[in-house]
Amino acid sequence: SPVPFGPEGRLEDKLHKPKATQTEVKPSVRFNLRTSKDPEHEGCYLSVGHSQPLEDCSFNMTAKTFFIIHGWTMSGIFENWLHKLVSALHTREKDANVVVVDWLPLAHQLYTDAVNNTRVVGHSIARMLDWLQEKDDFSLGNVHLIGYSLGAHVAGYAGNFVKGTVGRITGLDPAGPMFEGADIHKRLSPDDADFVDVLHTYTRSFGLSIGIQMPVGHIDIYPNGGDFQPGCGLNDVLGSIAYGTITEVVKCEHERAVHLFVDSLVNQDKPSFAFQCTDSNRFKKGICLSCRKNRCNSIGYNAKKMRNKRNSKMYLKTRAGMPFRVYHYQMKIHVFSYKNMGEIEPTFYVTLYGTNADSQTLPLEIVERIEQNATNTFLVYTEEDLGDLLKIQLTWEGASQSWYNLWKEFRSYLSQPRNPGRELNIRRIRVKSGETQRKLTFCTEDPENTSISPGRELWFRKCRDGWRMKNETSPTVELP
């Protein structure tokens, strides 16, 4: 059970002053320099004012230095995401210093007490960084603080208190409770480092949001809208856990931010791209797949530094597991006529055929409604790289899949029993790849046959490169 330390106000100098008892009080924050990928290697403990461990453990003053900061804990032992992250950093940056900030004594508390302790821990990290800065060749610009959950706000405090500016802070699903809407000096914020990038994976607009919903960095990335992560649904989790609980779902979605970051370290050749967008709904409509004016970026470790005047909210879809990368496509379908549509929205599916592979049958999510005599935009994504697209099959699903649609159909039938066949006409589909920024136009195979109705399909072949528009820059060109 957690040790009953009080909140920050009563901690005062417990960190460094010995109590007047026979046992000396140890500092509540330790810095463990991980010298090996092997989790069983004990590493070295660094402490302010003691230079010997730096020499003994070959601390590289000119290399990058990562500080990994855990969050609230119920167990008092480091969870395995930390081991994975340490390993991935060692794999990717072989000469780097990887320091685990152990604040378990202050994190293994009631959540409210742990929150109150974040400031003290931030101060300890800042003191360590100030001391390291006194050494020749150590540069704060080479420091990258990586904080998960409550640890993200600890990183914010550290960046705020240090003399100078740290190079980068990555917030991995920063904690929401007690931080949502807080003043910028009481949470992670863009002024805490030269570059602050954030991954949000467990935000909820209803109920308790474990992760913070508001943007808190220079770039704030919301994979899968920042809420429901693939592979973390009750079905997925309970399917693999004999006695699973909702806690497993929470852990899966909250921790997904860490695994996305790990993925960016170890699968450098499969970078995931996020696209700037004002909100999740617009992204779901496929409106936001542009890379112009820094509107797209790699996620995780490979993110390119962007210091916007305003927070930049970015979105992407991902797979359910590593590698998380998917391929995003914007599909623009111009519906030029519309017959007897009734009340219900059609259910469309597309299959994309490419030079490398063909996609599965992909649903077109209708975010609002199909507009006639207008261009309707959709987002589709595939797990595999299809190569250059060659043709598209558009299918209008026949039988209704939902009770709601069945009811609407029945109501439509009652009001218009002899409702003639529903139909709409589509001449072309314009497609833009998010990953390559390439634009293509697909035309119906038979120019005379442009109509589609329930249970029918329509085939489109590539008929033009581009949309007769100026080319946009490709994110793949900008890979580091």
Epitope: P2, R30, P39, S75, G76, I77, N80, L82, H108
Partner: antibody
Framework: QVQLVQSGAEVKKPGASVKVSCKAS????????IHWVRQAPGQGLEWMGH????????NNNEKFKDRVTMTRDTSISTAYMELSRLRSDDTAVYYC?????????????WGQGTTVTVSS | DIQMTQSPSSLSASVGDRVTITCRAS??????LNWYQQKPGKAPKLLIY???KLHSGVPSRFSGSGSGTDFTLTISSLQPEDFATYYC?????????FGQGTKLEIK
């Protein structure tokens, strides 16, 4: 070399409590966690819980939640496990084991075991 | 809790034989699988951790493999001192759980 030395065998009556000690040497006591694992006669191994000696934080298996208390004395590098309200099915060999800082770390060194017999 | 199931429960083999013991987890344990050897009246000893890493001082005839939910411990050429009970243990999720054990007996 790393060593964990446990206290001697105990015979207890049902309803009583037993406190087993585990003295560590050969490494920095506060750098690893100490776990308690028991083994009933002819049975397998069952994890009971752990203590982080650095600050005394504990986490127990739900099965023993309200009956087990883990403490430590860093001045003598010793961990303790107290099991209360003993029943006959608590008759087992109780082991302390050292574990690294992660969930994934194995139990790399074990005490020799303490036999606890619960009998009326 | 994650259930760990070992098979077989017991097996008889001769010195020099190659022996394989399997361990199945009730869910993916991310390769956080450790193997221990226990002799009668003694404490368990760590053999292999993180699926395939050999603990210091353990002979190279012991090896581990597997991923996801299925893991194996292999002894390439049995020696007289290898007759014991072997346990697998998952380090993925609390509470830590062990397999029921596999007793390796001399034929």
């Amino acid at each position: 070399q790393v060593q964990l030395v446990q206290s001697g065998a105990e015979v207890k009556k049902p309803g009583a409590s037993v406190k087993v000690s585990c003295k560590a040497s050969g490494y920095t006591f506060t750098d690893n966690t100490i776990h308690w694992v028991r083994q009933a006669p002819g049975q397998g191994l069952e994890w009971m819980g752990h203590i982080n000696p650095y600050y005394g934080g504990t986490n127990n298996n739900e099965k023993f939640k309200d009956r087990v208390t883990m403490t430590r004395d860093t001045s003598i590098s010793t961990a303790y496990m107290e099991l209360s309200r003993l029943r006959s099915d608590d008759t087992a060999v109780y082991y302390c084991a050292r574990k690294g800082i992660y969930y994934s770390s194995p139990f790399d060194y074990w005490g020799q075991g303490t036999t606890v017999t619960v009998s009326s | 809790d994650i259930q760990m199931t070992q098979s077989p429960s017991s097996l008889s083999a001769s010195v020099g034989d190659r022996v394989t013991i399997t361990c199945r987890a009730s869910q993916d344990i991310n390769n956080y699988l450790n193997w221990y050897q226990q002799k009668p009246g003694k404490a368990p000893k760590l053999l292999i951790y993180y699926t395939s890493k050999l603990h210091s001082g353990v002979p190279s005839r012991f090896s581990g493999s597997g991923s996801g939910t299925d893991f194996t411990l292999t002894i390439s050429s049995l020696q007289p001192e290898d007759f014991a009970t072997y346990y697998c243990q998952q380090g993925n999720t609390l509470p830590f759980t062990f397999g029921q054990g596999t007793k390796l007996e001399i034929k």
